[in-house]
Amino acid sequence: AITEAREEAKPYPLFPGPFPGSLQTDHTPLLSLPHASGYQPALMFSPTQPGRPHTGNVAIPQVTSVESKPLPPLAFKHTVGHIILSEHKGVKFNCSISVPNIYQDTTISWWKDGKELLGAHHAITQFYPDDEVTAIIASFSITSVQRSDNGSYICKMKINNEEIVSDPIYIEVQGLPHFTKQPESMNVTRNTAFNLTCQAVGPPEPVNIFWVQNSSRVNEQPEKSPSVLTVPGLTEMAVFSCEAHNDKGLTVSKGVQINIKAIPSPPTEVSIRNSTAHSILISWVPGFDGYSPFRNCSIQVKEADPLSNGSVMIFNTSALPHLYQIKQLQALANYSIGVSCMNEIGWSAVSPWILASTTEGAPSVAPLNVTVFLNESSDNVDIRWMKPPTKQQDGELVGYRISHVWQSAGISKELLEEVGQNGSRARISVQVHNATCTVRIAAVTRGGVGPFSDPVKIFIPAHGWVDYAPSSTPAPGNADPVLII
């Protein structure tokens, strides 16, 4: 250890013999107390009660006696002011003071950087009594110093409520550089400059920094810490570290991987979660993100029918939650579905295409050209229609549902009839005479009942009237047609 010995002052006459250096062998301590809590009481008894000492770092004792002669001021002896040593080495230093035996009780405590040292510190106070004074040596030892032991240590002695403070002893623990900031992993754009930072401290200072990229030194001439490395751009992944050097040696930072952002890999495992007549719910597992967060995804849908025009529908969605409901599809149709996702660099390739089918749905249009006429001879209403276009049946027709509502003199009655899929005509019995019959027809598939046609009305007269012309689905713009003769 390197020590800086400070000049020794003698504030109080010492007892004979060398002190505090190598103590004389015949000066065996009267009392040796290990620090239990870092707060060291030093007990001394004297029949004489001292007067009030002078405040400050030096106490001037007052003695009440016949002569009433004041004693010289009390102060700690000067000692080594600065101790420099390597990490993990042991160190021992001390404070010493000679106190007149007239004082009843004294207490010595150790302080570091303004805070009292309590707890697991190895401090011992030894007492060497003589005729007029007792020499007190307070020793402080650290078996394996760490950086955290750096600082300014002082002794304080309380004597009759007055405080005497020693000169500071500066402990400087030197060791290998210690990183306070290390480079961090990053994802960067290809051929784009970026910065890495490295900072290390001693003591001893200065700390010099070398940068290493893929085990090649970037700067053959070191930079003083802290150092910012501007990397001019990368075309492929690289590993960086920094070396911190000081007079004690070298410390190497952790190696960090710098990745190059790229387009994502295509999604995988596109699967069908649910199908309805007009929608398909799909999910997918995202591919590798290319070191850049996904922004959004695109679902591409094309009809699998070889006779279709091959047009592709594109649906854009957010990247999460890897789920999308494709809507506005035709019923009972086959589709090829692919998914592509993008990050800041660009779009991935499309996932492997999967085949999916929509289910049967209720027809989307009503039967056309509905015609209604009264066949009075048989007391029936005849109904005729044309089936909806095949494309809009949304499934295989299983039949039709006919709604006929009879209204007369405030009475209204609705009846429903089901007819088979083969027919395009039906006959219903007259339910009420002198009434209006309103007819609507819907196509039916296994997927459900389609929309009803516009209502067609026919008036059913009382018995004995002639046969009438038919009533039919109105031309656009004509609402509520009714035939009355």
């Epitope: 051929n191 940068w211 893929n214 090649s216 970037v218 053959e220 001439q221 070191p222 490395l229 001019p232």
Partner: antibody, heavy 118, light 106 residues
Framework: QVQLVQSGSELKKPGASVKVSCKAS????????MSWVRQAPGQGLEWMGW????????TYTDDFKGRFVFSLDTSVSTAYLQISSLKAEDTAVYYC???????????WGQGTLVTVSS | DIQLTQSPSFLSASVGDRVTITCRAS?????MHWYQQEPGKAPKLLIY???NLAQGVPSRFSGSGSGTEFTLTISSLQPEDFATYYC?????????FGQGTKLEIK
């Protein structure tokens, strides 16, 4: 503007010594290393090595160990190349070049022609 | 040591032409730098770290590549571009230069 100014041409006899200087200006001399590059007549560039301007420690490539010495006078921001026991094949233009991160030689002296002839 | 081979060694071209010079390394390197040397003058840094234009260099110069193959491209030759071009590798000591490519007026 960063400048590296080299000493003038030298004509030397075989066996003699020569010392080429390279004075740097407009930047902090001890922040960047200084490299030396040789170019024989009609030939390409050969990196001879460099000197750490902060510590004064030189590094030589294998072909330039022995008779070649790099040195510094930081008080005048000057680097030196000394060649001893000159041979005819040492005839070349010698360049100093500022040496930065990633082995980039970003500024060059104008070159010093050393001719070794009996 | 890493050997750098430039091709071609000589190149004749006309003003306005687009020219490409290739530099191949005997093993993978971290970066390639390019220098221009006019007759009787010192080399001048043109491109550093494979693709970065040095200060004051016109944008008609560009660099690319990685691993063992690197290129210098001049998009439209100007009269002042007729010179010798050298590549130099970083990644393995000692740093080495290519043998040079002399670009001449056709």
């Amino acid at each position: 503007q960063v400048q590296l100014v080299q000493s003038g041409s030298e004509l030397k006899k075989p066996g003699a010594s020569v010392k080429v200087s390279c004075k740097a200006s407009s930047y902090t001399f001890t922040t960047y290393g200084m490299s030396w590059v040789r170019q024989a007549p009609g030939q390409g560039l050969e990196w001879m090595g460099w000197i750490n301007t902060a510590s004064g420690v030189p590094t030589y490539t294998d072909d330039f160990k022995g008779r070649f010495v790099f040195s510094l006078d930081t008080s005048v921001s000057t680097a030196y190349l000394q060649i001893s026991s000159l041979k005819a094949e040492d005839t070349a233009v010698y360049y100093c070049a500022r040496y930065t991160n990633y082995g980039v030689f970003d500024y060059w002296g104008q070159g010093t022609l050393v001719t070794v002839s009996s | 040591d890493i050997q750098l081979t430039q091709s071609p060694s000589f190149l004749s071209a006309s003003v306005g032409d687009r020219v490409t010079i290739t530099c191949r390394a005997s093993s993978s390197v971290g970066y390639m730098h390019w220098y221009q040397q006019e007759p009787g003058k010192a080399p001048k840094l043109l491109i550093y770290a494979t693709s970065n234009l040095a200060q004051g260099v016109p944008s008609r110069f560009s660099g690319s590549g990685s691993g063992t193959e690197f290129t210098l491209t001049i998009s439209s030759l100007q009269p002042e571009d007729f010179a010798t071009y050298y590549c130099q590798q970083w990644g393995s000591l000692p740093f080495t230069f290519g043998q040079g490519t002399k670009l001449e007026i056709k």
